[in-house]
């Protein structure tokens, strides 16, 4: 028996859905009572679901797991996950045994979008040219950690004086903080970009300076 | 007939090497999973190790997980039992298994194995 | 892993009774479960896989019954080759195989 799975990893989104791929060749005259399938972490080694016996016997892995029953027997032994979470990310090995065993690794990938960004100004009045500001570029939610860049108004990147922080949430969302520092000049953009780097999601946000008033 | 025949056990100082061999007969050997089981003196029967028909998948004990290597050579039928960082506690006789669905259905005369400094 | 205790440790019968050799599992492996004949000296039979299954050639003296988590292997009428030390090993979880500590059946 020889066992295939996706070489790329599987990306899926938090709180949706995922099937992480296994298939066989089953030889002619095969039955499901020959089938012994266990999916497991890769890492820990814990189950995560199993078929044996001609008998799905259910998910180990917080009762969100199911396989495809009416696609076994053609080699289908797929498995899907139900509402994913940040901490399913990682590596399933699917083993597959009908007479002989074979195994194979497929890697899933969590992501979240980032939110649209919001721009605070600190100080955000009476503002002159040569003033230093701090602008705070926040987005929220997402995974895995941000790239995030900052740009002038002509598309200069800045790079100096920028503090970026992100913490994650209880269910492993990171929030993003960049810190720019800056000496206003006589008018100015300044643009943040946050990217997810799995799902190449852009989310920009920017503030305009003028004499007065301020533009977000 | 099916026929298993070890080979390569003898006697070897902790912290040594030591390699067997299994010659396979009798059946089409890239067809079934093989295995490794040991036999401590006077003691039961313990599961080492197993290696797919192909050849792509390996399983291991945990007691000799990242010091033994199963591997297998279809084109002269042989398993091989790579047993590196022996231990006292790997004394045993060493038998090859044909498997079939998990269950061994032939096994070999098995070749001992002695840890002893 | 599956833990499988054998009893009784030793059984002692004269030929032509019934022996009656248990196995319990730590948890269900339905009938995922074989049985082993190892006489002495030699090297370990299958008897019996699929918890009732007879292997090839083993005569019908030998059965096996159970599921789940207790196993029997009965001998129906012990003859003098019938003393051993049997082994049962399950493969329900079959990335970590197991085997039961043995039950030796001596001559009475």
């Known amino acids: 028996v020889e066992v295939q799975v996706s070489e790329d990893p599987v990306v899926a989104l938090v709180d949706t859905d995922a099937t992480l791929r296994c298939s066989f060749s089953p030889e002619p005259g095969f039955s499901l009572a020959q089938l012994n399938l266990i999916w497991q972490l890769t890492d820990t080694k814990q189950l995560v679901h199993s078929f044996t016996e001609g008998r799905d016997q259910g998910s180990a892995y917080s009762n969100r797991t199911a396989l495809f029953p009416d696609l076994l027997v053609q080699g289908n032994a797929s498995l899907r996950l139900q509402r994913v979470r940040v901490t399913d990310e990682g590596s399933y090995t699917c083993f597959v045994s009908i007479q002989d065993f074979d195994s194979a690794a497929v890697s899933l990938q969590v992501a979240a979008p980032y939110s649209k960004p919001s721009m605070t100004l600190e100080p955000n009045k009476d503002l002159r040219p040569g003033n230093m500001v701090t602008i705070t570029c926040s987005s929220y939610q997402g995974y895995p950690e941000a790239e995030v860049f900052w740009k002038d108004g002509q598309g200069v990147p800045l790079t100096g004086n920028v503090t970026t922080s992100q913490m994650a949430n209880e269910r492993g969302l990171f929030d993003v903080h960049s810190v720019l520092r800056v000496v206003l000049g006589a008018n100015g953009t300044y643009s943040c970009l946050v990217r997810n780097p799995v799902l190449q999601q852009d989310a920009h946000g920017s503030v305009t300076i003028t004499g007065q008033p301020l533009t977000f | 007939d099916v026929q298993l025949v070890e080979s390569g056990g003898g006697v070897v100082r902790p912290g040594e090497s030591l390699r067997l061999s299994c010659a396979a007969s009798g059946f089409t050997f890239s067809s079934y999973a093989m295995s490794w089981v040991r036999q401590a003196p006077g003691e039961g029967l313990e599961w080492v190790s197993s290696?797919?028909?192909?050849?792509?998948?390996?399983l291991y004990a945990d007691s000799v997980k990242g010091r033994f290597t199963i591997s297998r050579d279809s084109s002269n039928n042989s398993l091989y039992l790579q047993m590196n960082s022996l231990r006292a506690e790997d004394t045993a006789v060493y038998y090859c298994?044909?498997?079939?669905?998990?269950?061994?259905?032939?096994w070999g005369l098995g070749t001992l194995v002695t840890v002893s400094s | 892993e599956i833990v499988l205790t054998q009893s009784p440790g030793t059984l002692t019968l004269s030929p032509g009774e019934r022996a009656t050799l248990s196995c319990r599992a730590s948890?269900?492996?339905?009938?995922?479960l074989a049985w082993y004949q190892q006489r002495p000296g030699q090297t370990p039979r299958l008897l019996i896989y699929?918890?009732?299954s007879r292997a090839t050639g083993i005569p019908d003296r030998f059965s096996g019954s159970g599921s789940g988590t207790e196993f029997t292997l009965t001998i129906s009428s012990l003859q003098s080759e019938d003393f051993a030390v049997y082994y049962c090993q399950q493969y329900y979880d079959w990335l970590t195989i197991t085997f039961g500590g043995g039950t030796k059946v001596e001559i009475k």
């Open positions: 948890r269900s492996i339905l009938t995922s």
């Open positions: 298994a044909k498997a079939r669905n998990n269950f061994f259905d032939y």
């Open positions: 699929g918890a009732n």
């Open positions: 290696i797919s028909g192909s050849g792509g998948s390996t």
